[in-house]
Interface confidence: medium
């Protein structure tokens, strides 16, 4: 079962863990008693669409809640372990109240206020670091984000966002805390194509589909203008005018040997004789320059069974 937590006297809104993209109605129950939770807003705990609302939450609300999604051919049940904690007396936020850590490494970085999208909130969100209100101009609250300019290791710590949830003319406070750590500074490096090798020849079968992946690494961290792309006879794929040959939309990002890499895949739906005479160039480029590996296609030799 999934876990959710909140603080006493604050609003807590949770979603059914089974819901996925379902639009079917959701019913909520107290798991231990099987008692149905009402939808009437006059109750302190009530159901609204797929959400269960505690307005406000109390320590005694802690327990396991069941949600059932009723669809014509299948009922799905999910369980949610809800824990309501008393507000910590000191500034030290215990681990069990912390949301996932955010890792920053760039000159500008943002921290998102966790779970805020579940609530009916209005700006501004207030932000605190280690319980102190953030007032330096370097810290900018915008929508559900906190932007930090010129991040340094001194900015590491626990960041708490506080906002107001409005329901039925009443305002409820919500606070959420997450840690922020600063990774080592990223760097940009001249690109290197790790695959395919330089002047590589690839074997293909006429009439069959073929795909060639090109991977290049650029450095670590932010890569402004880094890209991997394919050219056919020195023409970008989109302008080549051959519908059978397409460059896959988007770039797969990965990390290889502590370095950030991009992969672009060239797909040929059905290889023709003409394709064997073309030159396929994989280009990797960033602010530091460009590197090119040329690939050719060759007909796969049939296996000699003599």
């Amino acid at each position: 079962s999934k876990s959710s937590w909140g603080l006493e006297n604050e609003a807590l809104i949770v979603r059914c863990p089974q819901r996925g993209r379902s639009t079917y109605p959701v019913e909520w129950y107290y798991s231990d008693t099987n008692e149905s939770i009402p939808t009437q807003k006059r109750n302190r705990i009530f159901v609204s669409r797929d959400r269960l609302k505690f307005l406000p939450a109390r320590v005694e609300d802690s327990g396991i809640y069941a949600c059932v999604i009723r669809s014509p051919n299948l009922n799905k049940t999910g369980y949610l372990n809800v824990t309501i904690h008393k507000k910590p007396p000191s500034c030290n936020i215990p681990d069990y109240l912390m949301y996932s850590t955010v890792r920053g490494s760039d000159k500008n970085f943002k921290i998102t206020c966790p779970t805020i999208d579940l609530y009916n909130w209005t700006a501004p969100v207030q932000w605190f670091k280690n319980c102190k209100a953030l007032q330096e101009p370097r810290f900018r609250a915008h929508r559900s984000y906190l932007f930090i300019d010129n991040v340094t290791h001194d900015d590491e710590g626990d960041y708490t966002c506080q906002f107001t949830h409005a329901e039925n003319g009443t305002n409820y406070i919500v606070t959420a805390t997450r840690s922020f750590t600063v990774e080592e500074k990223g760097f940009s490096m001249f690109p290197v194509i790790t695959n395919p090798p330089y002047n590589h020849t690839m074997e293909v079968e006429i009439g069959k589909p073929a795909s060639i992946a090109c991977s290049a690494c650029f450095g670590k961290g932010s890569h402004f203008l880094a890209d991997v792309l394919w050219q056919i006879n020195k023409t970008v794929v989109g302008n080549f005018g051959e519908a059978r040959i397409q460059e896959e939309e988007g770039r797969n990002e990965s990390s290889s040997n502590d370095m950030d890499c991009l992969t672009s895949v060239l797909r040929i739906t059905g290889v023709t004789e003409k394709d064997l005479s073309l030159e396929y160039d994989c280009l990797a480029l960033n602010l530091h320059g460009m590197i090119r590996h040329t690939i050719r296609l060759r007909r796969k030799q049939p296996i000699d069974h003599r």
Partner: antibody, heavy 118, light 107 residues
């Protein structure tokens, strides 16, 4: 055959200038980053500079930044290193090297000797 | 800058010996490591790139291993032509840096 051939080394006084050349053959020159690496007498290897395939980007070791300029002429398949304000500590064998797979120097020239002395 | 340290700085070995040279980077460089052999008066020659990939034409008695900060070059059975100085090099970031070298001579 893939080959790199340096020239232009010699004896020069401190504060003087020298231009090294490296003629490349046997490969598509513009497809590769090219580099200068030096080795002082009895010492280890020291990377000096790198230039991208079309010369749009250059990198330098701190020890030569502002004094040395790397350039290339792809029509002549030639790499250059313009060395100004030379110091005694620039005395070394200068190698031209091609940057290959995984940014390793896969092809090296035979080297040209630069001596900075009064 | 990333510092590269090599050990030993020199070693004496006999033909047929198994020789191991280690290189340590001052920070993690993944597998962005190369090894070179240099003989007196000659240019360096690439042996290994990407920490463990043997350069074309290099005898299989040479092998490389390691990732992160610790790397090893191994010569499984030393041959007369292997007496030389060996350098490691990181290409993870600029400035590209080399180790100080390990001289392998005849015992």
């Amino acid at each position: 055959e893939v080959q790199l051939l340096e020239s232009g080394g010699g004896l020069v006084q401190p504060g003087g200038s020298l231009r090294l050349s490296c003629a490349a053959s046997g490969f598509t020159f513009s497809d590769y980053y090219m580099n200068w690496v030096r080795q002082a007498p009895g010492k280890g290897l020291e990377w000096v500079s790198t230039i991208s395939g079309f010369g749009e980007s250059t990198f330098y070791a701190d020890s030569v930044k502002g004094r040395f300029t790397i350039s290339r002429d792809n029509s002549k398949n030639t790499l250059y290193l313009q060395m100004n304000s030379l110091r005694a500590e620039d005395t070394a064998v200068y190698y031209c090297a091609r940057l290959g797979a995984a940014r390793a120097f896969d092809i090296w020239g035979q080297g040209t000797t630069v001596t900075v002395s009064s | 800058d990333i510092q590269m340290t090599q050990s030993p700085s020199s070693l004496s070995a006999s033909v047929g010996d198994r020789v191991t040279i280690t290189c340590r980077a001052s920070q993690s460089i993944g597998s962005w490591m190369a090894w070179y052999q240099q003989k007196p008066g000659k240019a360096p020659k690439l042996l290994i790139y990407a920490a463990s990939t043997l350069q074309s034409g290099v005898p299989s008695r040479f092998s490389g291993s390691g990732s992160g900060t610790d790397f090893t070059l191994t010569i499984s059975s030393l041959q007369p032509e292997d007496f030389a100085t060996y350098y490691c090099q990181q290409s993870y970031t600029t400035p590209i840096t080399f180790g100080p070298g390990t001289k392998v001579d005849i015992k």
